[in-house]
Interface confidence: low
């Protein structure tokens, strides 16, 4: 049909920080390059219907559905979604094509479905159909990488069986300890699956996709390093591959390495060796021990021996299921207002955990650090001296763990007062929890020293605000004190704070803070 306009349908994916998204849908937007959705005429449909390729969007992503119409004259349009009409403002680009856009901000389930665009031009009417669905991230996986030897090459392949396919990178470091942190200049990253340089101090492989990043370290025994005070321990689940690297440096080639499991030589085919010169003409040898799929009987002490170095061992433990070992009893802490303090959890876990710290329904990133004794530690210092309940939550593929902490900040009470026709109440959040006194101010007692004991009702810790206890004291009004000034005082080991209340007949009550 010669009258039909030339139509192009595109999808624009916006970056999360795209500040231009959300302006009127007729505005051009800075974003990723548009993806052609190839609008094709739908066969056997009543009327002229173009159908765009189905669009899959991540939850919370922001997109624009855009139609470019090459047709003479003006156009008018209407969007319809789930039987509702939506505003449509066409504009014209530099090539004088009509441009119609639909912006979907922060995609949710309710925004998925069919979007119909009705366009009326001077020549003809037609409909464009977009089907938008949320990408099924339930099918997404991110599995920890594992190693395989490359056939007939002295190289390791890093494999992560993940969906969508991950980007794999090797993270290499040739110095010791702290300087091998990811951001350190000593760290080299190689975005490739195969690694030939296997002599480095610290070798990790990482895989990342939409779900995050997972890393596996090549477990290494270095015969030139002083052994750890506790035996290094490696956990694996049944069926996983085992890789241990033994590394040694000597002044010349006259040495060899061997692996033993529980004092028996490792079976043939379960090891291979590499060696190289280092810059100062010394010789580096490495000997890999590997088992492609471990069973329970692969548990034991793996010892690397050398003809020129003291041997060293590692304990390999094969488990049926992953675990998180830590004490889950809740812990209470009491600190001064300016005291430096961090919560910490010491745990042993396999596979590695993902964790969060939570306070007041807000989650904070969780860092974990490996200790020499096979344990890991996570610390949280960013509490800003806010009292309350802090929660550490950790999980891996097979286990979950939660631990509660309460932080109390020692401080003098602060008193707030409120009054009604029948009673006056005072509240305080000081710590340790305060005790209360009520005093009546009268001609006989201008300094408010006359203590009130009748009609006082103290409630300690009656309200828990994110774990922060609040103490209150209520005075029921009697004829004896109506019309008088009364003073409520909260006191603890750090000081006293008072508030003065005029017990009037009903109406606004003035409060006088008196510290």
């Amino acid at each position: 049909n010669q009258d039909l306009p030339v139509i192009k349908c595109v999808l624009i994916n916006h970056k999360n920080n795209d500040s231009s998204v959300g302006k009127s849908s007729s505005y051009p937007m800075v974003s990723e390059s548009p993806e052609d959705l190839g609008c094709a005429l739908r066969p056997q449909s009543s009327g002229t219907v173009y159908e765009a390729a189905a669009v899959e969007v991540d939850v919370s992503a922001s997109i624009t559905l855009q139609v470019l119409v090459d047709a003479p004259g003006n156009i008018s349009c209407l969007w319809v979604f789930k039987h509702s009409s939506l505003n449509c403002q066409p504009h014209f680009d530099l090539q004088n094509r009509g441009v119609v856009s639909m912006v979907i901000l922060k995609m949710t389930e309710t925004q998925a479905g069919e979007y119909l665009l009705f366009i009326q031009s001077e020549a003809t009417n037609y409909t464009i159909l977009f089907t938008v669905s949320i990408r099924n991230t339930l099918l997404y996986t991110l599995r920890r990488p594992y190693f395989r030897k490359m056939e007939n090459q002295d190289a390791l392949v890093c494999i992560s069986e993940s969906v969508p396919e991950p980007i794999v990178e090797w993270v290499l470091c040739d110095s010791q300890g702290e300087s091998c942190k990811e951001e350190s200049p000593a760290v080299v990253k190689k975005e490739e699956k195969v690694l030939h340089e296997l002599f480095g101090t610290d070798i990790r492989c990482c895989a990342r996709n939409e779900l995050g990043r997972e890393c596996t370290r090549l477990f290494t025994i270095d015969l030139n390093q002083t052994p750890q005070t506790t035996l290094p321990q490696l956990f694996l689940k049944v069926g996983e591959p085992l890789w241990i690297r033994c590394k040694a440096v000597h002044v010349n080639h006259g040495f060899g390495l061997t692996w033993e499991l529980e004092n028996k030589a490792l079976e043939e085919g379960n090891y291979f060796e590499m060696s190289t010169y280092s810059t100062n003409r010394t010789m580096i040898r490495i000997l890999f021990a590997f088992v492609s799929s471990v069973a329970r009987n692969d548990t034991g002490y793996y010892t690397c021996s050398s003809s020129k170095h003291p041997s060293q061992s590692a304990l390999v433990t094969i488990v049926e299921k992953g675990f998180i070992n830590a004490t889950n009893s809740s812990e209470d802490y009491e600190i001064d207002q300016y005291e430096e303090f961090c919560f910490s959890v010491r745990f042993k876990a396999y596979p590695q955990i993902r964790c969060t710290w939570t306070f007041s329904r807000k989650s904070f990133p969780c860092e974990q650090k490996g200790l020499d004794n096979g344990y890991s530690i996570s610390k949280f210092c960013n509490h800003k001296h806010q009292p309350g309940e802090y929660i550490f939550h950790a999980e891996n593929d097979d286990a979950q763990f939660t631990k509660m902490f309460t932080l109390n900040i020692r401080r003098k009470p602060q008193v707030l007062a409120e009054a009604s026709a029948s009673q006056a109440s005072c509240f305080s959040d000081g710590y340790p929890l305060p005790s209360w006194t009520w005093k009546k101010c009268s001609d006989k007692s201008p300094n408010c020293t006359e203590e009130i004991t009748e009609g006082v009702w103290n409630r300690k810790a009656n309200r828990k605000v994110f774990g922060q206890w609040v103490s209150s004291s209520t005075l029921n009004m009697s004829e004896a004190i109506k019309g008088f000034l009364v003073k409520c005082c909260a006191y603890n080991s750090l000081g006293t704070s008072c508030e003065t209340i005029l017990l009037n007949s009903p109406g606004p009550f003035p409060f006088i803070q008196d510290n």
Epitope: K149, N152, Q153, D154, G256, L257, T258, E268, G269, Y271, F272, E273, M274, S275, L287, S305, S306, S307
Partner: nanobody, 111 residues
């Protein structure tokens, strides 16, 4: 357990050639490095050459050019081809895989 057996040694005139063999038992041969060493009477054992599992070769710099190391994974055997032999090459030659050593084969070069 890997077992290694060297052969091919003998008496040869200076300037002559010999080809040493190192036969290994066990399936581990193809995935490991093989080193040749030698020990002259009254001297320390010294490294001669190495061939990696991928077939890359390394030599003691002073021997490069005269000696060639090779391997045949199908036969589980490594070789050391020695040309232009000199009297100072006289020694017992050993091959090594991992920490396993052969018994050695005597090479004597007469002037």
């Amino acid at each position: 357990q890997v077992q290694l057996q060297e052969s091919g040694g003998g008496l040869v005139q200076a300037g002559g050639s010999l080809r040493l063999s190192c036969a290994a038992s066990g399936s581990t041969f193809s995935r490991n490095y093989i080193d040749w060493y030698r020990q002259a009477p009254g001297k320390q054992r010294e490294w001669v050459a190495q061939i990696t599992s991928a077939g890359n070769t390394h030599y003691e710099p002073s021997l490069k050019g005269r000696f060639t190391i090779s391997r045949d994974n199908a036969k589980n055997t490594a070789y050391l081809q020695m040309n232009s032999l000199k009297p100072e090459d006289t020694a017992v030659y050993y091959c090594r895989i991992l920490d396993y050593w052969g018994q050695g084969t005597q090479v004597t070069v007469s002037s």
